[in-house]
Interface confidence: low
């Protein structure tokens, strides 16, 4: 399974949709900026077998899907774009799941890097906590949208590294 090939097109579409979802100028939200501590080291890629790498990517996309599937998200973003974004994420999840099965077989569970997955979970917990504290304000969502765009861009680099490893 050529993971980067199947995944990068969807990643690019998701990034485009995220960009289109922007409703207010980021410059009007500078005071709300926040460092969520993206777990960059987990996306280094050198220490992973491919199945492990896929599981970390899967976790990030699953968490992104969960974040944008909430009631508060539905009340914030333009519904048509949000549905398309969710569609894109779901397609990526399906692709990644198919890749894992191809890599390790249906019966085997890939050797997940639990620490890495936990780091991704905690990253999204910090994002959710920030949104809660900011009472899901438009600026808070704008900051989160920009952060997710950044994390998707970084995961794209991760995929390129995976491709070079092949």
């Amino acid at each position: 399974c050529d993971l980067p090939q199947t995944h990068s097109l969807g990643n690019r579409r998701a990034l485009i949709l995220l960009a289109q979802m922007g409703r207010i100028s980021p410059f009007s939200c500078l005071k709300d900026r926040h460092d969520f501590g993206f777990p960059q080291e987990e996306f280094d890629g050198n220490q992973f077998q491919k199945a492990q790498a896929i599981s970390v990517l899967h976790e990030m996309i699953q968490q992104t899907f969960n974040l944008f599937s909430t009631k508060d998200s539905s009340a914030t973003w333009e519904q048509s774009l949000l549905e398309k974004f969710s569609t894109e994420l779901n397609q990526q999840l399906n692709d990644l799941e198919a890749c894992v099965i191809q890599e390790v077989g249906v019966e085997e569970t890939p050797l997940m890097n639990v620490d890495s997955i936990l780091a991704v979970k905690k990253y999204f917990q910090r994002i959710t906590l920030y949104l809660t504290e900011k009472k899901y304000s438009p600026c808070a969502w704008e900051v989160v949208r920009a952060e997710i765009m950044r994390s998707f861009s970084l995961s794209k680099i991760f995929q390129e590294r995976l491709r070079r490893k092949e």
Partner: antibody
């Protein structure tokens, strides 16, 4: 497999209301938006609106905002559409269709309920 | 709202004939969200082509779809009796989602 079950027909009097049902099975009900579509005899299709079964959020086609009310009952995994102040113009087949992911968008439809408005 | 105009409204084709149905949008539609449905009398619509050019599961390879912007088409390379049906184009690029008025395709 995914199934959307709708009653075959409803006969109602002008001015009355009718509540149509769409019972889902074969998938996680709360994971997909449910849509409703109208088709008058020999005519095209009109999108009425959609509901997110997870939290009940609805989006309507402006043309149907005062006509249709979409609801869900998660316990019975059923979506409903109430049509009010019925006239002959509302006589049509009403389909429920499941939203979805890329190739699964509207890939699953109910059989449709024929609503006849007649005195 | 985006109005989708289909032409012709009704057409007849002989077995083996090449058939092209068109769908013209009143304003630009993102090609990823332009779909086609087939409907036979007394049945629900069936997803036929998604994202402009991808055939849904079980759709014969003689069908194809193409287009971009405001102009889309569904083509049958060689008409067969089982293809006689109504075909609707549909967009979910923007709200409200809309369908074309349909083309009824008959077999000669």
């Amino acid at each position: 497999q995914v199934q959307l079950q709708q009653p075959g027909a409803e006969l109602v009097k002008p001015g009355a209301s009718v509540k149509l049902s769409c019972k889902a099975s074969g998938y996680t009900f709360t994971n997909y938006w449910m849509h409703w579509v109208k088709q008058r005899p020999g005519q095209g299709l009109e999108w009425i609106g959609e509901i997110n079964p997870s939290h009940g959020r609805t989006i309507y086609n402006e043309n149907f905002k005062s006509k249709a009310t979409l609801t869900v009952d998660k316990s019975s995994i059923t979506a409903f559409m109430q049509l009010s102040s019925l006239t002959s113009e509302d006589s049509a087949v009403y389909f429920c269709a499941r939203g979805g992911l890329g190739p699964a968008w509207f890939a699953y439809w109910g059989q449709g309920t024929l609503v006849t408005v007649s005195a | 709202q985006i109005v989708l105009t289909q032409s012709p409204a009704i057409m007849s084709a002989s077995p083996g004939e090449k058939v092209t149905l068109t769908c013209s949008a009143g304003s630009s539609v993102d090609s990823s969200y332009l779909y086609w449905y087939q409907q036979k009398p007394g049945s629900s619509p069936k997803l036929w082509i998604y994202s402009t050019s991808n055939l849904a599961s079980g759709v014969p390879a003689r069908f194809s779809g193409s287009g971009s912007g405001t102009s889309y088409s569904l083509t049958i390379s060689s008409m067969e009796a089982e293809d006689a049906a109504s075909y609707f184009c549909h967009q979910w690029s923007s709200y409200p989602f809309t369908f074309g008025s349909g083309t009824k395709l008959e077999i000669k």
